[in-house]
């Protein structure tokens, strides 16, 4: 083994290095001392370190470690944070466009329905946005509410324009009839299936991204144990006590220390890998009815089809509803 | 009385969604994100090595510090902790993860379960399985648009796949992130608390 270089007879170099860490020189001995009170940088001979310096080194070592960890995760953190924000905004844009398309469809094809239809469409898409953001709303209920609200207007404005506007009594009956008679055919069920599947996937996708941010934030701000602090101090700073200012830790030794310090963090690895692969699988499946962009931007067309279906079956429906809701209508005409 | 089919499609306005030079859809954006995330798949297992390579370690020097003394870089002593008896590395590993790490692992397990459930072929209706489940991008004449309204000029044209990025206030390329492409790595510019 090569002999160590002679220690700094005056601890002058150590003092000038230590001063950068801790202005004020009172902790650095003038000349090497026995260092019997040291707990980490146990000396083999005289040392230029004091107990106070050792504590400062430990603090600095843990701080260095935290900074290194944060710089290691910076790019990953930025990637997920940016994407989570962009996707959330993009999904809101999709919802806004879907609402506009649906309103435009009503305005162009069914102008007599517009004031009320706009209101119902607006409520529906507000619920869609809330659902994506994690609100506890049932998608089937949202779709049912949309069709329940639309049908009385379609019935009174398109199918039976002779009815007075104050059809509050008949409205309740019509809402009930809408489901019992499957007035819109299988379109509501179709929309429920498509919307619930695509929104569920979208919501989980956003949740997963947000959890990704939480994972990085958690590991980013880990506080390292005292034991780890001692090992880091010994690796990075104990050489200074011997006046070996320019010496660096051995690579293998660094790896051993880091594995020890990060044993807990590394346990995340298995689940992190699975997270990325599961997210990839989800993304690969986000097409057709699992793609909210596709589903929501096509909703106006399916709603249009559903109204056409009602209109084309208007004769049969009007007769059946006339019988079913006759009581409500009579009360109303009185 | 029935609703007469004279001309259902009155409005002559054409609604066009954002024109974007680089036509980018949500699905391409998602795939791009996954590709970038996959480059971080070993992030946690590689952390110890990453931190060592970004903190001062002896690379070209003949001698290096093993925690206790100066040794030759390739000697057996170089990889060993010079002060084995002071406290045990193995013990440190055995302590297990911190409570916050255990908590985040539980959350990861839960989301992974959810993600798997959503991606399960079993949990999915095969595209054409149900009468009512088929759904693809629409069409409008020859140009892959969907139309609101009927034929002729009374329709509203809609881009079927939103070219959404044009509407976002910022571009998302991680490569262009501040301090990202030319990020000064601690290797070149050590964190100020290292004095070498």
């Amino acid at each position: 083994q090569p002999p160590p270089p002679p220690p700094d007879a005056t601890c002058h170099q150590v003092r000038s290095f230590f001063q950068r860490l801790q202005p004020g020189l009172k902790w650095v001995p003038e000349t090497p001392v026995p260092g019997s009170d040291l707990q980490v940088c146990l000396p083999k001979g005289p040392t230029c370190c004091s107990r106070k310096m050792e504590e400062k080194y430990q603090l600095t070592a843990r701080l260095n470690m935290e900074q290194l960890l944060q710089s290691a995760s910076m790019e990953l953190k930025f990637l997920i944070i940016q994407n989570a924000a962009v996707f959330q905004e993009a999904f809101e844009i999709v919802v806004r466009h879907a609402k506009n398309y649906t309103n435009a469809m009503f305005k162009n094809n069914y102008p007599s329905l517009t004031p009320q239809a706009f209101e119902f469409v607006g409520e529906f898409f507000t619920d869609v946005s809330l659902y994506i953001l994690g609100s506890d709303i049932n998608v089937d209920d949202m779709v049912n509410e949309l069709f329940d609200s639309l049908f009385p207007v379609i019935y009174t404005q398109l199918m039976n324009p002779g009815l007075p506007d104050s059809a509050l009594d008949i409205n309740e009956c019509l809402r009930g009839a809408r489901r019992d008679l499957k007035v819109f055919g299988n379109f509501p069920k179709l929309i429920m299936t498509q919307v619930s599947k695509s929104l569920q996937v979208t919501r989980i996708f956003l949740q997963a991204l947000n959890l990704g941010i939480e994972v990085i934030n958690t590991t980013d701000h880990l506080k390292f144990s005292k034991d780890c602090g001692r090992m880091l101090t010994r690796m990075w700073y104990c050489s200074y006590c011997q006046g070996l200012m320019m010496v660096k830790p051995c690579g293998g030794y660094c790896n051993v220390v880091m594995q020890g310090c990060m044993a807990g963090v590394v346990e995340i690895d298995k689940y992190w890998r699975e997270y990325i692969l599961s997210l990839e699988e989800l993304v690969n499946g986000m097409y057709r009815i699992y793609d909210m962009e596709n589903v929501l931007l096509g909703l106006f067309s399916t709603i249009h089809d559903s109204i056409q279906y009602v209109q084309k079956n208007a004769g049969k429906l009007t007769t059946t509803i006339g019988k079913l809701c006759a009581h409500s209508q009579q009360r109303q005409y009185r | 009385s029935a609703y007469y089919p004279e001309d259902l499609f009155i409005d002559k306005k054409v609604l066009k969604v954002a024109h974007v030079e680089h036509e980018e859809t949500l699905s391409s954006r998602r795939r791009e994100l996954i590709q970038k995330l996959k480059s971080f798949i070993s992030f946690y297992s590689a952390l110890p090595g990453y931190i060592c390579s970004h903190s001062p370690v002896a690379e070209n020097d003949t001698l290096c510090w093993n925690g206790q003394e100066l040794v030759e870089r390739y000697s057996q002593k170089a990889a060993r902790n010079g002060m084995k008896n002071q406290f045990n590395l193995h013990e440190l590993k055995m302590k297990g993860p911190e409570p916050v790490v255990s908590q985040i692992i539980d959350k990861l397990k839960h989301i992974n379960q959810l993600l798997r459930t959503m991606s399960m072929p079993k949990g999915r209706v095969l595209d054409k399985n149900l009468d009512e489940e088929g759904f693809e991008s629409g069409d409008c004449g020859d140009d892959e648009d969907e139309c609101i309204g009927g034929s002729g000029d009374g329709m509203i044209k809609v881009k079927n796949q939103l070219r959404f990025l044009a509407e976002l206030a910022y571009d998302l390329d991680v490569d262009d992130a501040p301090g990202n492409s030319q990020q000064a790595t601690p290797k070149d510019n050590e964190i100020s608390t290292f004095h070498n």
Epitope: G298 | S1, A2
Partner: antibody, heavy 119, light 107 residues
Framework: QVQLQQSGAELARPGASVKLSCKAS????????ISWVKQITGQGLEWIGE????????YYNEKFKGKATLTADKSSSTAYMELRSLTSEDSAVYFC????????????WGQGTLVTVSA | DIQMTQSPASLSASVGETVTITCRTS??????LAWYQQKQGKSPQLLVY???TLAEGVPSRFSGSGSGTQFSLKINSLQPEDFGSYYC?????????FGAGTKLELK
């Protein structure tokens, strides 16, 4: 102008299946339902069912459930009808027709496809 | 399903004459009825919907009337191109049904 172009005549063995096509042009395919109608030579017309191309939602005459399957391909603006387990009773001319959008009356018809089932 | 009964099954007439074809339904369908003309080897052509509204491009010599269960199609001053088969169809709701047809022949 609106046109519905149907595929050519089919000769099939009993028990076999045939798939007829109806290519639409001159209008937005996804904005209207397409119905299929059967006409046995020299006889009346029978409504088989309809498909809404956008959502591929289908509605059948009970009599033809299990016999006919309606599908649509939006990319080619084509509607299809598959007839399976063919018997001599399925020998007929089959028409596709487009309705007005809000009334079940058919303003536009394909030229018809003759299906002959014979051993 | 709604039954459609057309009469007569066939009739002969000359150019210039006026003819009436009738259609009876098994239940009240209000005005939800359409009439079609079909020539040999061709597809049907819509003449009338909603019992009395003429489809686009249909000559005014054709007229539809009736409501409830009784409907008729009247052709004034028959033209050579008017000969062929005529079908009624209700558009009251699915399933749609057609009459058996009336064959109009040149006398």
């Amino acid at each position: 102008q609106v046109q519905l172009q149907q595929s050519g005549a089919e000769l099939a063995r009993p028990g076999a299946s045939v798939k007829l096509s109806c290519k639409a042009s001159g209008y937005t395919f996804t904005s209207y339902g397409i119905s299929w109608v059967k006409q046995i030579t020299g006889q009346g017309l029978e409504w088989i069912g309809e498909i809404y191309p956008r959502s591929e939602s289908t509605y059948y005459n009970e009599k033809f459930k299990g016999k006919a399957t309606l599908t649509a391909d939006k990319s080619s603006s084509t509607a299809y009808m598959e007839l399976r387990s063919l018997t001599s009773e399925d020998s007929a001319v089959y028409f596709c027709a487009r309705d007005y959008g809000n009334i079940y009356s058919f303003a536009y018809w394909g030229q018809g496809t003759l299906v002959t089932v014979s051993a | 399903d709604i039954q459609m009964t057309q009469s007569p099954a066939s009739l002969s007439a000359s150019v210039g004459e006026t003819v009436t074809i009738t259609c009876r339904t098994s239940e009240n369908i209000y005005s939800y009825l359409a009439w079609y003309q079909q020539k040999q080897g061709k597809s049907p052509q819509l003449l009338v919907y909603n019992a009395k509204t003429l489809a686009e491009g249909v000559p005014s010599r054709f007229s539809g009337s009736g409501s409830g269960t009784q409907f008729s199609l009247k052709i004034n001053s028959l033209q050579p191109e008017d000969f062929g088969s005529y079908y009624c169809q209700h558009h009251y709701g699915t399933p749609l049904t057609f009459g058996a047809g009336t064959k109009l022949e040149l006398k």
